[in-house]
């Protein structure tokens, strides 16, 4: 799996989409988990409705929501009021029994609001550190991360 980068602005909402084969994953619940670094385990944040037929209903855990379009084959995660600590690696997963298939690996980056002049502290400004070579990553736009790339607009 390549890693797809989604960037959002602090304080705003970020939508992450995970496309999948609706036939292959028919009848399976989905989940959104946070990876503890690239090498660490993936800890469940939120999962779709216990009844697969009701997967279209939005479920929340704190500021994170999940909804599944099972016919169209798109899992959507919404991170509301994005904060610096929301940045990191995540996975969209398809659940079957105690197993989980990875649908997409996601890197969430939180950018500083250029209009917010308060102490930026833990926030990142594009171009402040190592950045993609010859790449333009817009806020809330995703792109795939190639092996060896460090996707810094961020500084950490």
């Amino acid at each position: 799996h390549n890693t797809t980068v989604f960037q959002g602005v602090a304080g705003q909402s970020l939508q992450v989409s995970c496309p999948y084969d609706s036939m292959k994953h028919w009848g399976r619940r989905k989940a959104w988990c946070r990876q503890l670094g690239e090498k660490g385990p993936c800890q469940r944040v939120v999962s779709t409705h216990n009844l697969w037929l009701l997967s279209f209903l939005r479920r929340w855990n704190g500021s994170t929501a999940i909804t599944d379009d099972t016919l169209g084959g798109t899992l959507t995660i919404t991170l509301r009021n994005l904060q610096p600590h929301d940045a990191g690696l995540y996975q969209c997963q398809s659940l079957h029994g105690s197993e989980a298939d990875t649908l997409r690996k996601v890197l969430v980056e939180v950018l500083a609001d250029p209009l917010d002049h308060r102490d930026a502290g833990d926030l990142w400004f594009p171009g402040e550190s190592e950045s993609f070579e010859d790449a333009h990553v817009e806020h809330s736009i995703s792109r795939s991360l190639l092996e060896g790339e460090i996707p810094f607009p961020p500084t950490s």
Partner: antibody, heavy 120, light 112 residues
Framework: QVQLQQSGAEVVKPGASVKMSCKTS????????ITWVKQRPGQGLVWIGD????????NFNERFKTKATLTVDTSSSTAYMHLSSLTSEDSAVYFC?????????????WGQGTLVTVSA | DVVMTQTPLSLPVSLGDQASISCRSS???????????LEWYLRKPGQSPKLLIY???NRFCGVPDRFSGSGSGTDFTLKISRVEAEDLGVYYC?????????FGGGTELEIK
């Protein structure tokens, strides 16, 4: 910018214990693994263990499992290492380090080191 | 534990020469996620170690392109194409794929 500031040098007696700190700044503390590394005078680097502040997950080198205790205080963005039952073998410089980025676990950011001297 | 064996122990070079350091692991160091977490660090006297190479061959930001990493399986190499005075110090390979993570014994790069 990312910074890791370690506590000052310690001189302790054999059998005693010591707790050193690694105060971080410039990034979301909960999001990155903190690693501890030992270097004795004239010797190589030894990986002690690491801790993930956001969940308290830890990995350890078995050699240090009864020697070192790793903890964090998220309110002050500080990692701690407690060393117990000190002997001359524990005289060393201890470093804390942080991984470079979510997609690069290499230790890119290091503290300046804490020198521990065990002496009667 | 994975044992990382570095050779040579000491490497005398003239400035401008190429230097090559070898690192051999006692078993393959491919993580369960498919990545090989082989890194190279330089420690100069009185300084903290500095990350040079990660995931076998990726240069960390700010590291000059005269440094290159290569290898696979159990055999890895760090090459410095033209040694400069600021490159002197002790080089360590490191595997971060299998706990406990382990460093090589170090190779001292010194002036001939």
């Amino acid at each position: 910018q990312v910074q890791l500031q370690q506590s000052g040098a310690e001189v302790v007696k054999p059998g005693a214990s010591v707790k050193m700190s690694c105060k971080t700044s410039g990034y979301p503390f909960s999001n990155f693994w903190i690693t501890w590394v030992k270097q004795r005078p004239g010797q190589g680097l030894v990986w002690i263990g690491d801790i993930y502040p956001g969940s308290d997950n830890r990995n350890f080198n078995e050699r240090f499992k009864t020697k070192a205790t790793l903890t964090v205080d998220t309110s002050s963005s500080t990692a701690y290492m407690h060393l117990s039952s000190l002997t001359s073998e524990d005289s060393a410089v201890y470093f804390c380090a942080r991984e470079a980025y979510y997609t690069n676990p290499g230790f890119a950011y290091w503290g300046q080191g804490t020198l521990v001297t065990v002496s009667a | 534990d994975v044992v990382m064996t570095q050779t040579p122990l000491s490497l005398p070079v003239s400035l401008g020469d190429q230097a090559s350091i070898s690192c051999r692991s006692s078993q393959t160091i491919i993580h369960s996620n498919g990545n090989t977490y082989l890194e190279w660090y330089l420690r100069k006297p009185g300084q903290s170690p500095k990350l040079l190479i990660y995931k076998v061959s990726n240069r960390f930001c700010g590291v000059p392109d005269r440094f290159s990493g290569s290898g696979s399986g159990t055999d890895f190499t760090l090459k410095i194409s033209r040694v400069e005075a600021e490159d002197l110090g002790v080089y360590y390979c490191f595997q971060g794929s299998h706990v406990p993570y382990t460093f090589g014994g170090g190779t001292e790069l010194e002036i001939k």
